[in-house]
Each structure stands twice: as structure tokens, then as C-alpha cells.
């Protein structure tokens, strides 16, 4: 299928997700994160497992990856910890956290996301944020500038359908809506923000892009709390 | 730096195949998806298609579909352009070049001539 | 697909000179134009991107402008180095395609 990208959004206002991250391999984009604290980084666990030979950096504050930007800075990675259940198979349990070697300098462009504690399903229909450096288009066009989607949570159930993702949603992970607007790949480890608050990351195993009845899947930090604050502790 | 090393030249019957190389150095390979353009003598670009060397996924220009098939070896950091039922209409220069930023093809090999002739 | 088309073939001009190449798109192209100059040899380099983005290494003489269908690269204070053919490139529709070209000679 087409590697992951935002499909159907448009270019994001400069600097207004001030906890958006690119996690860099060797100096290219490779996946999207989310700053949770000032020395964390959230992402997908799949983002890292191509990545043994290679640098792994995080850019913080930046709203085009090519052009300089005053708040934009890049941080080495200290400490890379893959949820320890997640697989290269599996969707399952794809969450990653990132130890800067510093703690962000924070500042209206770099600014840590509140993250949902509560374990609890978003209402279906509710209009979520997705925002990513994916590719936009088929023949992998790469946006320089943050690209972001509006999307409608999808209910399990219907995600489960056997014409969609026949029984692999969990309670672990959440579904939006795929028709032509969509995150795939691309944006793997990036963030679904519903009111304001960290919901889902989005997950990084290969799908058809921008078809209804492939949804896009999220993992949900809720149901990770524990893991989340054990790292960060 | 970045470098992409394409061979001269190439030259071949009609009705037959060829391979063209295209071998890339001095950054990550799987990370840039890899363009093929084609220059017949005098003219402009044509842009054939696509490669993303990471999963081998290829997107073709409808018009060169059936007569270019794209292929990489990550081992080696090449991608690969095969053509096939050679014609006269085939002649041309065939340049690879690196996915840049919005569309744009950020570094060009030298480009190979391929002739095609009996 | 998408038409672009570079109206004038053939530019003369002197060292030192400011010009300007243009470049027409059959259609809205949002902004997704692209500049590339090839030398006699045929080198290709990228020279501007979205559309007034300069690439990396690209020396500052060298700026672009546009939306929508209409777009332009302007060379100011030409260079020795700088007489070579210009096309432009829409990234925003597949299948890709370049405008005709546009070759700038020494007068």
C-alpha cells in the first residue's frame, strides 16, 4: 500500500501545535511525535525499527522542516524505550517515548500537550486534530511545511467490521474516519488531539490510505497511563 | 554530499530490454522515494514515475505504464529503471532523481543516453 | 494532466543583467511549482521549490514568485554560469510535468 501520509488536510498555522515533534533519522523526517513532558517525546514503537545504525534525533519548534525558524531546535535522543509488548507483526501496544539529551527549551512554539488519563472511549463523531510531515500524495510528495486533518472518530464496532479491520481494534486503540481524508505511515507517532488533549497516536502498520473502510488507527494513551508515568517517573 | 551515479550510456536493438542503474550515496537511501525523468534529444522533461525504496512501493506515470518497471536493492543503495519493447521512441536521455520538499526533485543523476537502434 | 508552459523558448541576455522566465499552469497548482536548470552538459539542479524556496546551496541571486496558474524565476546580476535552459515543474497533480524550457543565451 502507499506509505503514511496526511491525505486530504492542508498546511497547518505556523506553530500553533507547539507539542508537535519530528523524530529525524539521519537528518530526514522518519515519523511524528508529540512532546508529553520536557524531557519526553511520544511516539510509535515500529517508527524506530529500521533505525539500529542510524541517528535518531528529535526536531522541537518547527513548523517547515528545510527553512530556519527562530524556536526551532534539534535534540539527540538519550534514551529510546519501545512499549516493552509491542511487535514488528502487530499493531498492538505501538508506543515508543523518547528521553531528549536535555530538557526543551519551552516557549510559545514548544510547549508539552496534556495527555488523556481518563480510560475512556471518545464519543464516535467526535472531530479530532491529526497533524504530521507524511507524505501528501502517491507519488510520495514530502511536505516541507506541518500538514494537519480534521477527523471524526469512528465507533469500534463498525471499525471491527469484517470489511474493515475485522477484529483487530482493541480496547487498547480507537479508529477515525479514512474517506479520502486520512494519517497513515507517513505520520506514524503523531498525535490525535480531541479537545484540546492528547488522545491517540497514530500507529505505524502499513494500510491502504484514505479509504473508508480501512480507518485509520490510534493508539490510546489512556489505556497506556501506567506505562506512560513508569518511563517519565 | 549527496550523489547519484548513473552509467553514460547505453546502447541496445529494438524490441529488446535494458536496465538502468541509478546508485545512490551519501545519505540514507530508504529515506527518499526516487523519481525517474525521461529528455528525448531537443525536448523537455517527462516524468515517468516513482519508487519508495523502503517498502518498494511505485507509482508510474499512466504513460509509461507497461513500458518502465521500477526496482530497487537496498543493498547496494540502487534503484533501477527496466524498459522494455524497445522503439526508436525510446531514445532518450533517462535521468533518476531524489524526492525533495512539495514536489520537487532535489538531486539528479547525470543521466543515461539510451539508444535505440539496429 | 496538467499543461505548463514556459512561452518564451529562447532569452538573450548580458552579464549582469536581471531577468525574468515564466511559467504558466493550465490550472490552479497551489503554489507547487518547481525551477531546475540544465546545463549544456545536462546537469540538472534544483534551484527553487514552493515557489520561492531557494534549495540548499543555490546562491541568493536566484528567486521565484507566483500562485495560482502564474509563476516566475527572476535571476538578478547574471553570472557566467548562470546560460543554461530553466523549466519549470508543477508538484501538485499526479502524473508530474515540466514546462518547455527555456534557454538563456549569452548576448
Known amino acids: 500500500p502507499p506509505r503514511g501520509r496526511i491525505l486530504g488536510g492542508r498546511e497547518a498555522e505556523a506553530h500553533a501545535r507547539p507539542y508537535m515533534a519530528s523524530v529525524q533519522l539521519n537528518g530526514a523526517h522518519l515519523c511524528g511525535g508529540v512532546l508529553v513532558a520536557e524531557q519526553w517525546v511520544l511516539s510509535a514503537a515500529h517508527c524506530l525499527e529500521d533505525a539500529a545504525d542510524g541517528k535518531v534525533q528529535v526536531l522541537l519548534g518547527a513548523h517547515s522542516l528545510s527553512q530556519p525558524e527562530p524556536s526551532k531546535r534539534l535534540y539527540d535522543v538519550l534514551r529510546a524505550v519501545p512499549h516493552p509488548d509491542s511487535q514488528p507483526d502487530t499493531i498492538d501496544h505501538d508506543l515508543l517515548l523518547l528521553q531528549l539529551s536535555e530538557k526543551a527549551t519551552l516557549g510559545p512554539a514548544v510547549r508539552p500537550l496534556p495527555w488523556q488519563r481518563v480510560d475512556r472511549d471518545v464519543a464516535p463523531g467526535t472531530l479530532c486534530d491529526v497533524a504530521g510531515w507524511g507524505i501528501v500524495n502517491h507519488a510520495g510528495r514530502r511536505p516541507d511545511s506541518l500538514q494537519h486533518v480534521l477527523l471524526p472518530v469512528l465507533d469500534r464496532a463498525t471499525c471491527n467490521r469484517r470489511t474493515h479491520h475485522d477484529g483487530a481494534i482493541t480496547e487498547r486503540l480507537m479508529c477515525a474516519e479514512s474517506n479520502r481524508r486520512d494519517s497513515c505511515k507517513g505520520d506514524s507517532g503523531g498525535p490525535l488531539v480531541c479537545g484540546g488533549v492528547l488522545e491517540g497516536v497514530v500507529t505505524s502498520g502499513s494500510r491502504v490510505c484514505g479509504n473508508r473502510k480501512k480507518p485509520g488507527i490510534y493508539t490510546r494513551v489512556a489505556s497506556y497511563a501506567a506505562w506512560i508515568d513508569s518511563v517519565l517517573a | 554530499q549527496v550523489q547519484l551515479q548513473q552509467p553514460g550510456a547505453e546502447l541496445v536493438r529494438p524490441g529488446t530490454s535494458v536496465k538502468l542503474s541509478c546508485k545512490a550515496s551519501g545519505y540514507t537511501f530508504t529515506s527518499y522515494w526516487m523519481h525517474w525523468v525521461k529528455q528525448r534529444p531537443g525536448q523537455g522533461l517527462e516524468w515517468i514515475g516513482v519508487i519508495d525504496p523502503s517498502d518498494s512501493y511505485t507509482y508510474y506515470n499512466q504513460k509509461f505504464k507497461g513500458k518502465a518497471t521500477l526496482t530497487v536493492d537496498t543493498s547496494s543503495s540502487t534503484a533501477y529503471m527496466q524498459l522494455s519493447s524497445l522503439t526508436s521512441e525510446d531514445s532518450a536521455v533517462y535521468y533518476c532523481?531524489?524526492?525533495?520538499?512539495?514536489?520537487?526533485?532535489?538531486?539528479w543523476g547525470q543521466g543515461t543516453s539510451v539508444t535505440v537502434s539496429s | 494532466e496538467i499543461q505548463m508552459t514556459q512561452t518564451t523558448s529562447s532569452l538573450s541576455a548580458s552579464l549582469g543583467d536581471r531577468v525574468t522566465i515564466s511559467c504558466r499552469a493550465s490550472?490552479?497548482?497551489?503554489?507547487?511549482l518547481n525551477w531546475y536548470q540544465q546545463k549544456p552538459d545536462g546537469t540538472v539542479k534544483l534551484l527553487i521549490y514552493y515557489p520561492s524556496r531557494l534549495h540548499s546551496g543555490v546562491p541568493s541571486r536566484f528567486s521565484g514568485s507566483g500562485s495560482g496558474t502564474d509563476y516566475s524565476l527572476t535571476i538578478s546580476n547574471l553570472e557566467q554560469e548562470d546560460f543554461a535552459t530553466y523549466f519549470c515543474?508543477?508538484?501538485?497533480?499526479?502524473?508530474?510535468?515540466f514546462g518547455g524550457g527555456t534557454k538563456l543565451e549569452i548576448k
Open positions: 515543474q508543477q508538484g501538485n497533480t499526479l502524473p508530474y510535468t
Open positions: 532523481a531524489r524526492n525533495g520538499y512539495d514536489g520537487a526533485m532535489d538531486y
Open positions: 490550472q490552479d497548482i497551489s503554489n507547487y
